[in-house]
Amino acid sequence: IFPLAFFIYVPMNEQIVIGRLDEDIILPSSFERGSEVVIHWKYQDSYKVHSYYKGSDHLESQDPRYANRTSLFYNEIQNGNASLFFRRVSLLDEGIYTCYVGTAIQVITNKVVLKVGVFLTPVMKYEKRNTNSFLICSVLSVYPRPIITWKMDNTPISENNMEETGSLDSFSINSPLNITGSNSSYECTIENSLLKQTWTGRWTMKDGLHKMQSEHVSLSCQPVNDYFSPNQDFKVTWSRMKSGTFSVLAYYLSSSQNTIINESRFSWNKELINQSDFSMNLMDLNLSDSGEYLCNISSDEYTLLTIHTVHVEPSQETASHN
């Protein structure tokens, strides 16, 4: 949950308000209470945003882009509150807003700078392309341009590919990293400096497991304490890589504490889940269960990927029958 907007106070009657795309914000303005209150909000000194005088709104010449998106705190005007409630901000709303307040006593003018940020939750994906393995950190919509950093075994990596596409109001960014043949752990951080919001993706490959047919395998998946906050909503998904694509075996939603299992041989330990341990068991292994198993723990602030490689070998009996 984020605040409606946050203010940064700067000198000369000017404040900076930071809002999020499509969310509501408040442009603050206060004055010394008095009678005969007149309030005019303008954008870039040209466009009429909102006018109030003689006890009511006068929106006849309001710029169409603000229609049905602005209101004042009418019960608070007599107490010196001229703040503007602004609905569903877009990146086109960025800029300088001027609040003119006139009363029987004085006239004051306040300036508010509105900055709008976008940060749709990023994702970290693990992909196989032919014989290569890639980690991809991507964010579908972000503004302003974020800072993306990669680390390998906690050491920053200078090589940082960024595929960027810009739309009218935000960027879409992919940052792929080739990790073919690597057993290292990787971390990708995407930071939106305006919204002061950081997302981290972490990828860990576990040692390969060799199992015999008909046995069961236990695969560990425990969140790293640095990122994990049990109070925050998150989702855990176990998937298996089959011919280049992942199929979901099971998932768990923390908000509802629901577990959905798509593979009858898959089991989760409820006791362990309550202790934030999402390790799983797969029973009665067969040869086709060989492959990569991915545990994905995701929230708004992080994605933790754990990869297990399982090799299922024929049992002695099966081998002797052949």
Epitope: V38, K54, S61, Y100
Partner: antibody
Framework: QVQLVESGGGVVQPGRSLRLSCAAS????????IHWVRQAPGKGLEWVAV????????YYADSVRGRFTISRDNSKNTLSLQMNSLRVEDTAVYYC??????????????WGQGTLVTVSS | DIQMTQSPSTLSASVGDRVTITCRAS??????LAWYQQKPGKAPKLLIY???SLESGVPSRFSGSGSGTEFTLTISSLQPDDLATYYC?????????FGQGTKLEIK
């Protein structure tokens, strides 16, 4: 102290033009709406026009709409009234008057001393 | 346009008298009414705004009342300096309109 000084009045023939000016001092001119109000000799007061503090809005009385144009120069603290197609009934003392605030309130807190316009053939 | 009608047109009173001037609007103007005083050869001066609010610097013997369509200006104790013409003005909507004026004479 607040001062409004009108100038530009005089005698003019019907159908001709005249430009009145109002010089403001003693307050932040760009914060206030300014009106023109006129008074025919021996008659009552008649509101003529208003221009808002930022020049964004201008309103006129029906009797002058289309003939008179109000304007302001906030950098020079001056207000103007361009009067075209003048009629005998436009003869009056023309006052510039400051609004309570932006121009939206519509009453007159400070007045100039007035300038006389006489339209006569 | 909203018509404003003042009565009486002329009023003669003595120093110390309580004087009342009435103003009627042709339609409701809430409390958006101002009163002005104009002395001979001078510009008008604001006395009252919003029907009953006394403008700063105006003597307290002046008061206003009313709302809707009926308004009054009262001078509680007439002074020689109050010789003037008094105008009401509605500022509910454009075009702003004045009453025809009430000329106050001192007996």
């Amino acid at each position: 102290q607040v001062q409004l000084v009108e100038s530009g009045g005089g005698v003019v023939q019907p159908g001709r033009s005249l430009r009145l000016s109002c010089a403001a001092s003693g307050f932040t001119f760009s914060d206030y709406g300014i009106h023109w109000v006129r008074q025919a000799p021996g008659k009552g007061l008649e509101w003529v026009a208003v221009i808002w503090y930022d020049g964004s809005d201008k309103y006129y009385a029906d009797s002058v709409r289309g003939r008179f144009t109000i304007s302001r120069d906030n950098s020079k603290n001056t207000l103007s009234l361009q009067m075209n197609s003048l009629r005998v009934e436009d003869t009056a003392v023309y006052y510039c008057a400051r609004d309570r605030s932006s121009g939206a309130m519509g009453y007159f807190v400070y007045w100039g001393q007035g300038t006389l316009v006489t339209v006569s053939s | 346009d909203i018509q404003m009608t003042q009565s009486p047109s002329t009023l003669s009173a003595s120093v110390g008298d309580r004087v009342t001037i009435t103003c009627r609007a042709s339609q409701s103007i809430s409390s958006w009414l101002a009163w002005y005083q104009q002395k001979p050869g001078k510009a008008p001066k604001l006395l009252i705004y919003k029907a009953s609010s006394l403008e700063s610097g105006v003597p307290s013997r002046f008061s206003g009342s009313g709302s809707g369509t009926e308004f009054t200006l009262t001078i509680s104790s007439l002074q020689p300096d109050d010789l003037a013409t008094y105008y009401c003005q509605q500022y509910q909507s454009y075009s702003y309109t004045f009453g025809q004026g009430t000329k106050l004479e001192i007996k």
